[in-house]
Interface confidence: low
Amino acid sequence: HTAAQDNCTCPTNKMTVCSPDGPGGRCQCRALGSGVAVDCSTLTSKCLLLKARMSAPKNARTLVRPNEHALVDNDGLYDPDCDPEGRFKARQCNQTSVCWCVNSVGVRRTDKGDLSLRCDELVRTHHILIDLRHRPTAGAFNHSDLDAELRRLFRERYRLHPKFVAAVHYEQPTIQIELRQNTSQKAAGDVDIGDAAYYFERDVKGESLFQGRGGLDLRVRGEPLQVERTLIYYLDEIPPKFSMKRLT
């Protein structure tokens, strides 16, 4: 079953159009914007989600960086080119023929150029640092409880294998979630850390991508964990290539 059979919807992606025209009359769902058939038993790729988002009304987007090569998605939304598997194409261009190279999470990793720009390969983002600040609470959360709850959240809601949640750091009110996933570690069927991070980012912003579910109600020992700021840093297997003028 690729989608909820009774009313033919996609539990993991509300930005889809579904109809019972799959094999044997089964429900089949296609992503808005691209028309690509999606597997509703797992997360939809970030590329297809961004493409679907660009076909809908627009919304605006963004403590310590892991190192000098960490990227933050400061460019905001764009209408990406996705490959047949739903991954970002290594080179992205806009309608004015301005092009740039992206990593596996779709974040720009080179200066912008023209149509002659070459992006030889899609460079994998293997380390994601999600930096959160929670709203004030009566006291600090117990680190062990917080760690367990966030690990469980990534497994249950985003279906990310626990081995890819490398660490959860906490210094009130800052929480840092480290996701690590090398190319060699990612097996067929494993959720990509970039997709899990994107779903989480949308959840904490109150823009859940899941069909028919309420927003994320995250609690630690019954105490609500309300996020008031999110920053996500991306580290690639190969450092990004920016000219010095961008760094000054």
Epitope: P11, A148, E156, L216
Partner: antibody, heavy 123, light 107 residues
Framework: AVTLDESGGGLQTPGGALSLVCKGS????????MGWVRQAPGKGLEYVAA???????GYGAAVKGRATISKDTGQSTVRLQLNNLRAEDTATYYC?????????????????WGHGTEVIVSS | ALALTQPSSVSANPGETVEITCSGG????????YGWYQQKAPGSAPVTVI????KRPSNIPSRFSGSTSGSTNTLTITGVQADDEAIYFC???????FGAGTTLTVL
């Protein structure tokens, strides 16, 4: 190959205490949740207790308050202590390994079972 | 505790495809998780055929598969064999309960 060997079963007296031990081998013991599931004669499976890789614990309703689950990572063993035994505790007790480490709520995650040890509570 | 619902019995001829459903598990962050456990005879050790909805232990044949639609999980045995005759229990995450078992008879 993963193997789970239970010991400690046998005839027990009502009101007494029981200690079951499960020794695991063939996997990194410290990385996975472990637990106990029992089956009374002619009945279905019933969750008893589990302990996560981080040592958080969970207990089934029928044994809550009477059971304690613990583990010795160095010895690759998990122990179930069950006090105030009742006739309805009579069952085959299976040691079961989770495919994951992070939670003691694990009944959907069991990927390996022991052969079981029989416990009879009778006077 | 939540009660899991599964049929008490199903039957199939060798080579046919059989589906056993399980529903009623508790959700966690809106998702549902089930496992399937095969027991050839009462008192014999169960064997995991599917865990965590879809995962199959390496020693289990590929004819066993699991899928989830909403809150219902389905164990599918494609090309059922005489050796598959057993009781199949489903188990649910969070509620930590098992179903009463489904007896599969291979005709």
């Amino acid at each position: 190959a993963v193997t789970l060997d239970e010991s400690g079963g046998g005839l027990q007296t009502p009101g007494g205490a029981l200690s079951l031990v499960c020794k695991g081998s063939g996997f990194t013991f410290s990385s996975y949740a472990m637990g106990w599931v029992r089956q009374a004669p002619g009945k279905g499976l019933e969750y008893v207790a589990a302990i996560s890789s981080g040592s958080s614990t969970g207990y089934g309703a029928a044994v809550k308050g009477r059971a304690t689950i613990s583990k010795d990572t160095g010895q690759s063993t998990v122990r179930l202590q069950l006090n105030n035994l009742r006739a309805e505790d009579t069952a085959t007790y299976y040691c079961a390994k989770s495919g994951y480490g992070g939670s003691a709520s694990y009944v959907s995650d069991i990927d390996a079972w022991g052969h079981g040890t029989e416990v009879i509570v009778s006077s | 505790a939540l009660a899991l619902t599964q049929p008490s019995s199903v039957s199939a001829n060798p080579g046919e495809t059989v589906e056993i459903t399980c529903s009623g598990g508790g959700d966690y962050y809106g998702t549902y998780y089930y496992g399937w456990y095969q027991q050839k005879a009462p008192g014999s050790a169960p064997v995991t055929v599917i865990y965590d909805n879809t995962k199959r232990p390496s020693n289990i044949p590929s004819r066993f598969s699991g899928s989830t639609s909403g809150s219902t999980n389905t164990l599918t045995i494609t090309g059922v064999q005489a050796d598959d005759e057993a009781i199949y229990f489903c188990g649910s995450y969070k509620s930590n309960t098992f179903g009463a078992g489904t007896t599969l008879t291979v005709l």
